[in-house]
Interface confidence: medium
């Protein structure tokens, strides 16, 4: 299969290998994503799923605006002009490049032989979370837990699903009189994507004077949705390998296949309740998220704040 990375909010076209470019075509697209119940076969004629994905006249598949819940597997099976079956298999991951990282609350100077907070590096609006790294005089700084300490925090925006990363660097300089330069970089970990770097900060080291938490995200935000709307619950865990995620509603396990995303389309009052996710990691055992409450209520014309990332309507298609 082929790994595809698509930028959130932008259209994605997947080609169906072997498919004749014009009808008549013998082809079948199916997808298994955060939006579907297991595998979903798409009709070439279009249909109820067209706001999610639709087959173009040339046999390609169009996702009008990719979102986090569109991550998954897409498969096409086509019969070419010579009658041979050709299969295409895509693993789609989505990404969002954050703004340039910044070092906030930088130290004005450092003191030798004692722990000093250098500053906090902040990156906002990434997907997936990505990583922050610190550099000292242009070289990667590897935390050793003694002279170099890094405290990291990852938060996910409840509405957009995008990540904010914070990394606080604490160092114990060995001697005074030096002027080290610190910088921080953000990397999404995607091929051909350069890291984003902060502006460097140079600090003076002086000699010492006298001693002197797993997250459950809900979309729409607040968990309030109109009847017939869609709720997306995402269990955000930064663990490798990714743990198995099960879902609990009102204290009882839901009989669903493990998945970090729980999609509830067409909601009604039956779907109301308190939801949590349980992540089971081989080495750590189960870990339950804080609960979120889902309430179904008509929101009127102020707007339902419902839907997921990338669920806008399609552009005009011939």
């Amino acid at each position: 299969g082929q790994n595809i990375t698509a930028r959130i909010g932008e259209p994605l076209v997947l080609s169906c290998k072997g498919a004749p470019k014009k009808p008549p075509q013998q082809l079948e697209w199916k997808l298994n994503t955060g939006r579907t119940e297991a595998w979903k076969v798409l009709s070439p004629q279009g249909g109820p799923w067209d706001s999610v994905a639709r087959i173009l006249p040339n046999g390609s598949l169009l996702l009008p605006a990719t979102g986090i819940v569109d991550e998954g597997t897409f498969r096409c099976r086509a019969t070419n002009r010579r009658g041979k079956e050709v299969k295409s298999n895509y693993r789609v991951r989505v990404y969002q490049i954050p703004g340039k990282p910044e070092i906030v609350d930088p130290a004005s100077e450092l003191t030798a032989s004692v722990p000093n907070k250098v500053g906090t590096c902040v990156s906002e609006g990434s997907y997936p979370a990505g990583t922050l790294s610190w550099h000292l005089d242009g070289k990667l700084l590897i935390p050793d837990g003694k002279e170099t300490l890094v405290k990291e925090e990852t938060r996910r925006h409840p509405e957009t699903g995008l990540f904010t990363l914070r990394s606080e660097l604490t160092v114990i300089p060995t001697q005074g009189g030096t002027h080290p330069t610190f910088s921080c970089s953000f990397s999404l970990g995607l091929p051909r994507r350069r890291p984003l770097n902060t502006a460097p900060i140079q600090l003076r080291v002086r000699e010492p004077g006298p001693p002197e938490g797993i997250q459950l995200l809900v979309e729409p935000e607040g968990g309030i949705v109109a009847p017939g709307g869609t709720v997306t619950l995402t269990c955000a865990i930064s663990a490798q390998p990714p743990p198995q995620v099960h879902w609990i509603k009102d204290g009882a396990p839901l009989p669903l296949a493990p998945s970090p995303v729980l999609l509830l389309p067409e909601v009604g009052h039956e779907d109301e309740g308190t939801y949590s996710c349980v992540a089971t990691h081989p080495s750590h055992g189960p870990q339950e998220s804080p609960p979120v409450s889902i309430r179904v209520t008509e929101t009127g014309d102020e707007g339902p704040a419902e839907g997921s990332v990338g669920e806008s309507g399609l552009g005009t298609l011939a």
């Epitope: 109820p48 706001s51 017939g228 009127g300 014309d301 707007g303 339902p304 399609l314 552009g315 298609l317």
Partner: antibody
Amino acid sequence: EVQLVESGGGLVQPGGSLRLSCAASGFTFNNYWMTWVRQAPGKGLEWVASIDNSGDNTYYPDSVKDRFTISRDNAKNSLYLQMNSLRAEDTAVYYCARGGDILDSLHFWGQGTLVTVSS
Amino acid sequence: DIQMTQSPSSLSASVGDRVTITCRASQDVGIYVNWFQQKPGKAPRRLIYRATNLADGVPSRFSGSRSGTDFTLTISSLQPEDFATYYCLEFDEHPLTFGGGTKVEIK
């Protein structure tokens, strides 16, 4: 409270045209698929046309394709069905229905408007 | 096109009876089936959505279940106001397809 009110029904001769309207209120209109469903006297329900949230994509069964056109005006919270080349078999109560935000489904229905095609 | 074969087309039952109506889809439609109730001269009313979920304001005596491509609407204890016609609908593919309807009459 969700409300859908159809209008525009009436008696029309075979080959004639009619335009049905559906006024929507109580929900954010442009977030939902909208659908027309009809019911011939004493018969079951039949899907007639659907339109997605944006209005860019429309869908019809073969029985009305090329004769009926569904459209929406999101600014006016209104749904329309333009019916041309009407036949006796198009005689029915026509219902306007609200679908879902991602999927075309049927949630809330109007009370319907009667269309009679007869000479 | 998907066919939704609904059975029985009519049934006679008494108040308090358990009533079961079935729709069989001609191909896999996932969980994307709704059930509706319609009384004479009235618009249909949604009872069950996504195969098994009770719609707002619907009494708990109504329930829906799914086994593969078979979908069942059950009324656990029939009440006088339940005498009506019931329809299933698949909304996984266009054309959206209704079952032929089941008329529930008083015995």
